[in-house]
């Protein structure tokens, strides 16, 4: 029961994590305009992996895709690649883990096969989570590097746009979504690997030797502290590994009712 719970929870946590990675990859707010020097701007810029957007205070938003591939900075391409690899591995891991779930019966699949599939999906989730965390961290590092280099005509490394003196970019919501989602996927993967240990049948090098006495038939297994009557199965005591993770909702601060500018 503990194994099933651990495996099921690992699957759910990974599912949420991968959904978060997909959401982060699609989000436009990877970097947002830093308003420290200009808090009263009527034009707000933010950028994603695939397009850059401008939101006017009038409420109109215009987004433009990065329609070039070769013209994009290598770092941005690397982040895209890491996120896509993370999504693909996560998606495959989810497919594999569905078939590996102990609560789902598929033909006469043995526990050893399910254990292998659980381990495979766990490893995939771990790598997927690491890819997402790495991608987001590389992008964050890129932002930190560029933050103080906001001189006129500086190449921002974001789709080849020219930057004026005032505009600097800081961490956007997608980075935090990506970090949390990557972490969840990683935790889910670890839980799957733990569940795999519980699913794997214990293999012994020696066959059990039966000694037939005049009375009851009792089977003795060498090297063990357990004895069985041959009718019931051994019950194993296992720890339940409860991997919990919290996500913080992004809080969007609206202008106050009395915003003086």
């Amino acid at each position: 029961m503990a194994v099933t719970a651990c495996q099921g929870l690992g699957f759910v946590v990974s599912l949420i994590g991968i959904a978060g990675i997909i959401a982060a990859t699609c989000m436009d707010q990877w970097s947002t305009q830093d308003l420290y020097n200009n808090p009263v701007t009527a034009v707000f810029n933010y950028q994603g992996l695939w397009r850059s957007c401008v939101r006017e205070s009038s409420g109109f938003t215009e987004c433009r895709g990065y329609f070039t591939l070769l013209g994009l900075p290598a770092m941005l391409q690397a982040v895209r690649a890491l996120m896509i690899v993370g999504i693909v591995l996560g998606a495959i891991g989810l497919l594999v883990s569905i078939f590996a779930l102990k609560c789902i019966r598929i033909g006469s699949m043995e526990d050893s096969a399910k254990a292998n599939m659980t381990l495979t999906s766990g490893i995939m989730f771990i790598v997927s989570g690491l890819c997402a965390i790495a991608g987001v961290s590389v992008f964050a590092n890129m932002l930190v590097t560029n933050f103080w280099m906001s001189t006129a005509n500086m190449y921002t490394g974001m789709g080849g746009m020219v930057q004026t003196v005032q505009t600097r970019y800081t961490f956007g919501a997608a980075l935090f979504v990506g970090w949390v989602a990557g972490g969840l996927t990683l935790i889910g993967g670890v839980m799957m690997c733990i569940a795999c240990r519980g699913l794997a049948p214990e293999e012994t090098n020696y066959k059990a030797v039966s000694y037939h006495a005049s009375g009851h038939s009792v089977a003795y297994k060498p090297g063990g502290f357990k004895a069985s009557t041959g009718f019931g199965s051994n019950t194993k005591n296992k720890k339940i590994y409860d991997g919990g993770a919290r996500t913080e909702d992004e809080v969007q601060s609206y202008p106050s009712k009395h915003d003086y500018v």
Epitope: S58, G59, V162, T164
Partner: antibody, heavy 118, light 113 residues
């Protein structure tokens, strides 16, 4: 078609308050910021503040030092601008204007003349 | 606050001739995100509210005759009336649409010579 109809002219004494209304029609009132701009005789246009009727958010020009209050009644598609502690230099034509793409004012009310005189 | 300075204060041009109005801002109005200049031009005839002519420094509003054109970038902008008509007699204002508080130029009065 879009129309912004303002209330009639007002004569006020110094220290009093004035409340000007602006009734919108021909568009979704709640979806566009409504601005107030004034024009004193021989002076340049001066932006006073704006309100988003959808949620009541407001932004004000700090030069008015908290004397301006902008409100709205979405059910009546009407925006209001109240200016308190009136002075003679507040004598001006007050306009409401819809905020549009490019952060410009694409439709204006006909204007309301507010005269502050003792 | 961004200060908008218009020149000249008044301008007398013959019918059919070109009229040029200048507007200078104390800070750049160019937004790097979309490479657009947040400057707007309005026309105000006597006894009427201002009328939108041009936004984003060079984009004409619908219904505005093509003899009106806007140009410039950063801090220096120009409104040009290629062939002045009698109905173009008015005061023209530029407006900073980039930073709060939104500010206007002092206006340029265009008359017929």
């Amino acid at each position: 078609q879009v129309q912004l109809v303002q209330s009639g002219a007002e004569v006020k004494k110094p220290g009093a308050s004035v409340k000007v209304s602006c009734k919108a029609s021909g568009y979704a009132f709640s979806n566009y910021w409504m601005n107030w701009v004034r024009q004193a005789p021989g002076q340049r246009l001066e932006w006073m503040g704006q309100i988003y009727p959808g949620n009541g958010d407001t932004k004000y020009n700090g030069n008015f030092k908290g004397r301006v209050t902008i409100t709205r009644d979405t059910s009546a598609s009407t925006a209001y601008m109240e200016l308190s502690s009136l002075r003679s230099e507040d004598t001006a034509v007050y306009y409401c204007a819809r905020y549009y793409r490019g952060n410009c004012f694409d439709y204006w009310g006909q204007g309301t003349l507010v005269t502050v005189s003792s | 606050d961004i200060v908008m300075t218009q020149s000249p204060d008044s301008l007398a041009v013959s019918l059919g001739e070109r009229a040029t109005i200048n507007c200078k801002s104390s800070q750049s109005l160019l937004n790097s995100g979309n490479q657009k200049n947040y400057l707007t031009w309005y026309q105000q005839k006597p006894g009427q509210p201002p009328k939108l002519l041009i936004y984003w420094a060079s984009t004409r509003d619908s219904g505005v005759p093509d003899r009106f054109s806007g140009s410039g970038s950063g801090t220096d902008f120009t409104l040009t009336i290629s062939s002045l008509q009698a109905e173009d007699v008015a005061v023209y204002y530029c407006q900073n649409a980039y930073t709060y508080p939104l500010t206007f130029g002092g206006g340029t009065k265009v008359e017929i010579k």
